[in-house]
């Protein structure tokens, strides 16, 4: 079973070299690059463990198959 | 079973507009977090926007913004993009995908099957 994977940059602000830093009731998010609102942490039940390592994403398709790899 | 739809997709020509829409069910739509991805043809998938679930924040992609609007109606669990000013270069199948956080970090979670957009003269 395979994963999609996105590229995503480095924990970076698009302005600065800095990391970004986020404060408590946020979570930094690779793809838009920036802090969102992670009060309400949610992660389907899709009936597959899901890895949160960065640029990885299970992506279910009709009866729960996962697509191949993407580079 | 979480279930992301999308529709919307379709054959138009350069300048014109389409509208995505993507129907979900299965989970708590109005708490979570969505993002539009997309994948051209022999191409890697580019993330194209991001709306938060109370729509207080959003985001575009560098390539899309200004002709792109990302929406949602929590009370119908539908998330929408309004594609205007389409190029060829948007030409690609278009992910409704959800956003799962942990860790202090966020990513990509349940992705929809996606719709074709292919612009064309």
């Known amino acids: 079973m395979g994963a999609r994977r996105l590229r995503v940059r480095s924990q970076r602000s698009r302005d600065s070299s800095v990391p970004t830093q986020c404060n408590q009731t946020e979570c930094f998010d690779p793809l838009v690059r920036n802090c969102v609102s992670c009060e309400l942490f949610h992660t389907p039940d899709t009936g597959h463990t899901s890895s949160l390592e960065p640029g990885t994403a299970l992506q279910p398709q009709e009866g729960s198959a996962l697509r191949p790899d993407v580079a | 079973e979480v279930q992301l739809v999308e529709s919307g997709g379709g054959v138009v020509q350069p300048g014109r507009s389409l509208r995505l829409t993507c129907a979900a069910s299965g989970f708590t739509f109005s708490t979570s977090g969505m993002y539009w991805i997309r994948q051209a043809p022999g191409k890697g998938l580019e993330w194209v926007s991001y709306?938060?679930?109370?729509?207080?924040?959003?985001y575009y992609a560098d390539s899309v913004k200004g002709r792109f609007t990302i929406s949602r109606d929590n009370s119908k669990n539908t998330l929408y993009l309004q594609m205007n000013s389409l190029r060829a270069e948007d030409t690609a199948v278009y992910y409704c995908?959800?956003?799962?956080?942990?860790?202090?970090?966020?990513?990509?979670?349940?992705w929809g099957q996606g719709t074709t957009v292919t612009v064309s003269s």
């Open positions: 995908v959800t956003q799962s956080c942990g860790a202090g970090k966020c990513y990509p979670g349940v």
């Open positions: 709306i938060s679930s109370s729509s207080s924040t959003i």
